[in-house]
């Protein structure tokens, strides 16, 4: 007995698709193998149509396809355009055609249903809207025009020129009769739904000299499409709806058991909490389409999305509708990354990106998730030497360590940075991942002077006390500007005495700056790393003036000023426009995205992603 | 809600046939697939047989145990899916179920069902 399994029979009419899945045990083996896709001849062969390797007969040459999800143990061949030629016995099957691991599948393609004479064919997408014309003769121009649907053997009044309408239909049919130059009349029927489908006669007057007119109207409810991605990246559903929804509230939901299908996002402000920091609706264009990007992508995220428009933001009886079947791929090519950061008030985090090794040219983004309205994502760094005003000497974003990672830099934290950044590139889109930066209670593990005044010409030291845990780390001074922060020569001024409880592994390290030039005025790092895998900062501004007395500054914890304000956000910033977020190549040759105007926000309130990778910041 | 009710279940000898029906009502929308479990006595409720459709396309599927002897159809206009047993066995003596999806997943999977008639008891004597 065969473990594969599939449908036994596939009945089609020609001119449609058909979606054949084959079931297989997700063994290591089994998962890799050839998939195959072949015709029994009459004397027992079977000739291999398609399969996984590549491999596409003539036959179905731009009208098929074999997709493999080793995940589930399934593989998928999708067939369209078919035709009655297509008729046969088939296998879906695993390895060499002749060695039994397979399943028969029997396919009939007929040639359609049979229908009464005259009768027009209106074929449908469920939600959307049919109009049936029914043309009558000039002696009936008078008289009541109707629709009846056919139910069983009798036909049932649906609606009339009377003004009657079946209960079924309220709301959403109308009777149109045209001018008198035009002997039709339609009826419009919107929010189709699926048991709308059927044999339909229109009708002009009542008696033996009535014109009438079959119609058969086909509900389509849209098969899903297959999407395949992988744990930890990202997808996006793109939603066309058509324009005749374009002011109608969309949604995207996801379907739990049976008809319930829970709103993942809406353009009325819903989301589900699952969904929260990796989300983003993006607007809607004029033709009403929409898409919806989600990141950091959970093997429980996989299951049947649909997209829809209707008034209420969510999934109702004939909602126009989009249906994906979404599988998450647990055999990731993303990397496992810390998806919760923490980090002290004060502090700083490093947060490590994955992007696709391949594409090490691509240009690499840093940006702040908001969940006002559908989610937006502002941009805070890119790679390519911008950086938001307000983060100004206090993010960088670094190449390193490279090889399919970058590494972001943020300290001076403080509770308002809280929250959930994403990691993306101009490169391959599904390789958008997502974190959470928490702020914990704490003290920074770095001391540092707070502002720090220079003299010109004169010479400044600047100390860094590195606590004994940083024993084995390299520790360095670097000067901040917006492509990187370049390292500077520093000196070992041996133990600290700035932490209690701490040995001889302590250090102080110093920063020199000899002969102050107005050019030395700016941010300085110092920081610790391993390799290229980098750990805490913490920065000083540096300010230069004139000189006012003789001699040289050596600044020390006690002398240093407070630390400055926090700088407040400006109205001005760079965003990633939703578009450019589905697509970042559209913001690869222009820096300036889109200048939004922005309120500062108060403390963003972060929710927990209930992950357990966590990466420590300044606190541990 | 959809509700799914189960009849033509019945007591035959081996060998005759039975045609068990199973009628959808409510609100059926957006049904993926309708199929066919059994249950006998001590045993653990397995798969039967299952019919799927898109448009005007349907897939059926069988368990190995009943290929060559059940047919599965529907009747779109009646929201009725049939169950033909034909050859029957002592061994096909259980408990039929009828029940519905809007999931896309594999059919043999109980928990992919999540509408379930009362089920119609099917005793087949030798």
């Known amino acids: 007995k065969s473990p594969i399994f599939g449908p036994e029979e596939v009945n089609s009419v020609e001119g449609n698709s058909v979606s054949i899945t084959c079931y297989y045990p997700p063994t290591s083996v089994n998962r890799h193998t050839r998939k195959y896709w072949c015709r029994q001849g009459a004397r027992g062969g079977c000739i291999t149509l398609i399969s996984s390797e590549g491999y596409v007969s003539s036959k179905y040459a731009g009208r098929a396809n074999l997709t493999n999800f080793p995940e589930n143990g399934t593989f998928v061949v999708n067939i369209a355009q078919l035709s009655q030629d297509d008729s046969g016995r088939y296998k879906c099957g695993l390895g060499i055609n002749s060695r039994g691991l397979s399943f028969d599948v029997s396919l009939e393609v007929s040639q359609g249903p049979g229908l009464l004479n005259d009768t027009k064919v209106y074929t449908v997408d469920l939600g959307r809207t049919v109009t049936i014309n029914c043309p009558f003769k000039t002696e009936n121009a008078q008289k009541r025009k109707s629709l009846y649907k056919q139910i069983g053997l009798y036909p049932v009044l649906v609606i009339d020129s009377s003004g009657y309408v079946n209960p079924n239909y309220t709301g959403r049919i109308r009777l149109d009769i045209q001018g008198t130059g035009q002997l039709l009349f339609s009826v419009v029927i919107n929010q189709l739904r699926l048991s709308d489908a059927g044999q339909y006669l229109c009708q002009a007057g009542d008696d033996s000299n009535s014109n009438k007119k079959n119609a058969d109207l086909q509900v389509l409810k849209p098969e899903p499409e297959l999407v395949y991605e992988d744990l930890r990246g990202s997808v996006t559903f793109h939603c066309a709806l058509g324009p005749e929804v374009a002011n109608v509230a969309k949604f995207l939901c996801r379907q739990s058991s049976g008809e319930n299908c829970d709103v993942v996002v809406n353009t009325l402000g819903k989301r589900a909490p699952a969904f929260e920091g990796r989300i983003l609706l993006n607007p809607q264009d004029k033709d009403g389409s929409f898409s919806v990007v989600i990141t950091g992508l959970r093997k429980e995220d996989a299951g049947r999305y649909l997209c829809g428009a209707h008034s209420d933001g969510q999934l109702q009886e004939g909602s126009p509708i989009q249906a994906w079947q979404l599988f998450v791929n647990e055999e990731s090519t993303i990397p496992r990354s810390p998806t919760v950061v923490k980090g002290v008030a004060g502090g700083s985090v490093a947060v490590l990106c994955p992007y696709n090794r391949k594409e090490s040219k691509s240009i690499k983004y840093w940006c702040l998730w908001e969940g006002a309205q559908n989610g937006r994502c502002p941009l805070l760094v890119d790679s390519e030497g911008w950086v938001k005003a307000q983060y100004e000497g206090r993010l960088s974003l670094l190449e390193e360590p490279g090889n399919g990672t970058f590494t972001v830099i943020l300290n001076q934290l403080t509770s308002r940075d809280a929250g959930f950044y994403w990691c993306l590139t101009n490169g391959d889109t599904l390789w958008r991942t997502t974190v959470e930066i928490k702020i914990i209670e704490g003290e920074p593990n770095l001391k540092v002077p707070g502002n720090v005044t220079a003299v010109l010409g004169e010479t400044l030291k600047v100390p860094c006390h590195f606590p004994c845990k940083f024993s084995s780390y390299e520790k360095y001074w670097c000067k901040w500007n917006n492509t990187g922060c370049q390292a500077l020569p520093s000196q070992d001024e041996g133990p600290s005495k700035a932490f209690v409880n701490c040995d001889e592994n302590s250090r102080l390290v110093s920063l020199t700056l000899n002969l102050v030039t107005r050019a030395d005025e700016g941010w300085y790092w110092c920081g610790v790393k391993q390799g290229h895998f980098y750990g805490e900062t913490a920065a000083v501004y540096v300010a230069v003036e004139e000189r006012k007395a003789a001699g040289s500054r050596d600044v020390s914890l006690a002398k240093a000023d407070a630390a400055p304000d926090e700088k407040v956000l400006d109205s001005g910033f760079r965003e990633i426009e939703n578009k450019a977020i589905q697509d970042p190549r559209l913001f690869a040759e222009e820096k300036a995205v889109a200048d939004t105007r922005d309120q500062a926000d108060g403390s963003r309130a972060s929710v927990d992603s209930g992950s357990s990778e966590e990466q420590g910041g300044s606190s541990r | 809600e959809v509700q799914l009710v189960e009849s033509g279940g019945g007591l035959v000898q081996a060998g005759d046939s039975l045609r068990l029906s199973c009628a959808a009502s409510?609100?059926?929308?957006?049904?993926?697939?309708m199929g066919w479990f059994r249950q006998a006595p001590g045993k653990e409720r397995e798969f039967v047989a299952t019919?799927?459709?898109?448009?005007?396309?349907?897939?059926?599927y069988y368990a190995d145990f009943v290929k060559g002897r059940f047919t599965i159809s529907r009747d779109n206009a009646k929201n009725t899916v049939y169950l033909q047993m034909d050859s029957l066995k002592p061994e096909d003596t259980a408990v039929y179920y009828c029940?519905?999806?809007?999931?896309?997943?594999?059919?043999?999977?109980?928990?992919?069902?999540?509408?379930w008639g009362q089920g119609t008891q099917v005793t087949v004597s030798s």
């Open positions: 029940a519905a999806t809007t999931l896309l997943t594999d059919p043999r999977a109980l928990n992919a069902y999540a509408y």
């Open positions: 409510g609100r059926t929308f957006p049904t993926y697939a």
């Open positions: 019919i799927r459709w898109s448009g005007s396309t349907q897939y059926k």
